[in-house]
Amino acid sequence: CSCAPTHPQTAFCNSDLVIRAKFMGSPEIIETTLYQRYEIKMTKMLKGFDAVGNATGFRFAYTPAMESLCGYVHKSQNRSEEFLIAGRLRNGNLHITACSFLVPWHNLSPAQQKAFVKTYSAGCGVCTVFPCSAIPCKLESDSHCLWTDQILMGSEKGYQSDHFACLPRNPDLCTWQYLGVSMTRSLPLAKAEA
């Protein structure tokens, strides 16, 4: 299995469903398929109201049964721990993989929690987080924000991932904006080439 590095905003925007949920136990293999499913208890839906229609909640999260097929393995035994799950919808079912953005809710900073609840959605369909994985890299559009965490931090979990969102500054321009108390502060030199 391999996964492309993903900024949390990209994970939010590319997912059909973003929910908060608790895992209720061990996975159950679904016979005659390559999938297994985890029973979950959804506590809040953050994205996907349109996609799910009348569905009141999701009881299961489906994932490939093998790690080589990017199956997700849930390691926590704590059934009261709440997780942020960003997944895909297929045939009315929530699907997740080892590549999904799936983290304990309490591991997110208050600013990140607010971003998943409210802020990231403002950038979906308008702005694009553009990964810079090797120098030189340049922006292909004014609607792109250059994501340099992999180069500067050596990891996809860096300053931009933790503290910034790529949001419209005006109809034709997107810039990195700080996820702190004020959402009006922009990251200096955000449009410069790396």
């Epitope: 299995c1 391999s2 996964c3 492309a4 059909d16 005659t32 398929t33 390559l34 999938y35 490939p64 093998m66 790690e67 080589s68 097929l69 990017c70 199956g71 895909r88 919808l89 297929r90 045939n91 699907h95 993989t97 080892a98 590549c99």
Partner: antibody
Amino acid sequence: QVQLVQSGAEVKKPGESLKISCKGSGYSFTSYWIGWVRQMPGKGLEWMGIIYPGDSDTRYSPSFQGQVTISADKSISTAYLQWSSLKASDTAMYYCARYYGFEYDLLFDNWGQGTLVTVSS
Amino acid sequence: DIALTQPASVSGSPGQSITISCTGTSSDLGGYNYVSWYQQHPGKAPKLMIYAGNNRPSGVSNRFSGSKSGNTASLTISGLQAEDEADYYCQAYDSSGYPVFGGGTKLTVLG
């Protein structure tokens, strides 16, 4: 690098049995599904079945269930496709390939060179 | 069950761009399902060209690109070259996770 090397071409008569092989190297053979794909002369690709060599869990396409047997010997990193009684319609090129996951995608990322099976009286 | 439909043949002249379509249904390709594309030269094994929508394995030319709109995935080859003449197959997977191939498209490079 990942390599799948298949056994050589075979010429058989109807009713005979046959077992062809696919040897993997350059990766953890027991951790990935191996699929078998048929291509009849001048036709397209058809998935026959897959096997997980780690525990020999095997799944067949409904079209091939009962027609062939897929097996593996993890000690020598080899997967097999076998027939107990060949028919003329089994004449085809057979490929093995590694079934792989990338994010939400499932695909065949590496292929063997193919084994041509000819069944003729 | 999932079925993928491709045109039997397409053709183009060197330097041109061509597009090969792969059509499914709203329950498979209309969902999140990505499509992979394989190239097969006569007498050779298939080779992965595009995966997860528009990712290329190392060594595959950036003249090859993939896209998806609704129930149809597409493979576009720009700056067509003689060596691009081959059969092309799309592949997705069904709701059980098992692979499904399109019927294949024969690409002819004219002239």
